[in-house]
């Protein structure tokens, strides 16, 4: 059976978090999308594109930009002056439903923490890049940073579905609710979604 | 298993016209789009065009040395994608591979075995 | 259109020692710090494998002694230690934009 597992990444305050999250698959271009923090039963929607995504066309709420490029199948995600609080554990989403959320990769666990960054090339105000690719495997991708550039082997590119968990989490639990979380192959999920356009007929071509 | 089985090609006249056929199974189809890359012998790999998914309305880019003269269509309930070839020319002499890709701008992961076209008097 | 030019041409490596092939590119292939650059095999009478996507991604079932590297517009593709097997012509293309375009292939052949 395939697992999630959850990757941690430690930032300093201030610091900027950039995700690039990567749905590959045309039919998801104008799919609206969200960035969510799980807390408690559900996960907390933080940011979410237009219904449909409009291509390149940034959405902002407080610290968070969400920018979807349909062109290359891409969702950038920017969380700016990150905070102590901010720590927690993060998903981007294919969005439909709070309870059935589509994920497009394997959950960040975010971890802030107070004090000057004593990493390479970072600062109070830098940014720091996570590639996100979508995994069907329980292994955890490192971080990939712009500079320097390193080489990583990935995981088979397709979507993974997730039906989020309906019970309670924090960081001490998180991976043990991810492994009861429910996978849906691809296929299934061409049965499952009801295409964006013939909910809204609606393109960006 | 994904297969992608191409057909149609043989010999044909400068100025003639061809419809190559790509058979695919073994993935969903609606959902990728498909390519067709072509090899003159002993010549490098060139990329003829592709079609994009229903989704992106089933647009269609070319090369600059085919534009005009191939058209790439596919039909979802049959699993196929075809390239239409009009005003064919000597140099468009060449295996055509149908390629599928990985999705948006992905790369090529899976490929068929080719099908040969000669265009000669 | 984004022209890509590999080099060498062609390329004689003993066998265990290690190849470099290169691919340049025209204009920078990268969206988002994402290099849409990719690696092929071809060996006779075969259609090509893929070894490498997105410049740096092993394809799942390839030997990891193939490794690629780079961004922008400079690219390398690296066999550690050639195997008798890897000989073979070698494409780089890059689907960042459209058309899509090909290297113009690298033969190894061993030493």
């Known amino acids: 059976t395939t697992e999630l597992t959850e990757e941690k990444y430690e930032y300093k305050e201030g610091q900027t978090l950039e995700v690039k999250c990567d749905y590959t698959l045309e039919k998801f271009a104008s799919s609206q999308k969200a960035w969510q923090k799980m807390e408690g039963k559900m996960p907390k929607i933080l940011a979410k594109t237009e219904r449909p995504s409009e291509n390149s066309h940034p959405v902002q709420v407080g610290r968070i930009t969400l920018e979807d490029y349909h062109d290359h199948g891409l969702l950038q995600v920017q969380m700016t002056n990150l905070q102590v609080e901010d720590s927690g554990l993060y998903q981007c989403v294919i969005y439909q439903h709070p309870k059935e959320s589509h994920v497009l990769f394997n959950p960040i666990c975010l971890v802030v923490t107070k004090g000057s960054s004593g990493t390479p090339g970072s600062s109070e105000n830098s940014t720091q890049n996570v590639y996100r690719t979508p995994s069907t495997t329980a292994k955890a991708l490192g971080p990939r940073y712009t500079s320097p550039r390193t080489v990583t082997q990935a995981p088979p590119e397709s979507t993974v579905v997730v039906s989020t968990p309906g019970s309670e989490i924090n960081l001490t639990n998180v991976t043990d609710i991810i492994r009861e979380q429910k996978l849906i192959s691809e296929e299934d999920l061409e049965q499952k979604l009801i295409s964006e356009e013939d909910l809204h007929h609606h393109h960006h071509h | 298993e994904v297969q992608l089985v191409e057909s149609g090609g043989g010999l044909v006249q400068p100025g003639g016209s061809l419809k190559l056929s790509c058979a695919a199974s073994g993935f969903t189809f609606s959902t990728y789009a498909m390519h067709w890359v072509r090899q003159a012998s002993g010549k490098g790999l060139e990329w003829v065009g592709r079609i994009r998914t229903k989704s992106s309305n089933y647009a269609t880019y070319y090369a600059a040395s085919v534009k005009g003269r191939f058209t790439i269509s596919r039909d979802d309930s049959k699993n196929t994608a075809y390239l239409q070839m009009n005003s064919l020319k000597t140099e468009d002499t060449a295996v055509y591979y149908c390629?599928?890709?990985?999705?948006?701008?992905?790369?090529?992961?899976?490929w068929g075995q080719g099908t040969l076209v000669t265009v000669s008097s | 259109d984004i022209v890509l030019t590999q080099s060498p041409d062609s390329l004689a490596v003993s066998l265990g020692e290690r190849a470099t092939i290169n691919c340049r590119a025209s204009?920078?292939?990268?969206?988002?710090?994402?290099?849409?650059l990719h690696w092929y095999q071809q060996k006779p009478g075969q259609p090509p494998k893929l070894l490498i996507y997105?410049?740096?991604n092993l394809e799942s079932g390839v030997p990891d002694r193939f490794s690629g590297s780079g961004s922008g517009t400079d690219f390398t593709l690296t066999i550690s230690s050639l195997q008798a097997e890897d000989v073979a012509v070698y494409y780089c293309q890059q689907s960042n934009e459209d058309p899509y375009t090909f290297g113009q292939g690298t033969k190894l052949e061993i030493k």
């Open positions: 997105r410049a740096s």
């Open positions: 390629t599928r890709d990985m999705g948006i701008r992905r790369q090529f992961a899976y």
């Open positions: 204009e920078s292939v990268d969206t988002f710090d994402y290099s849409f």
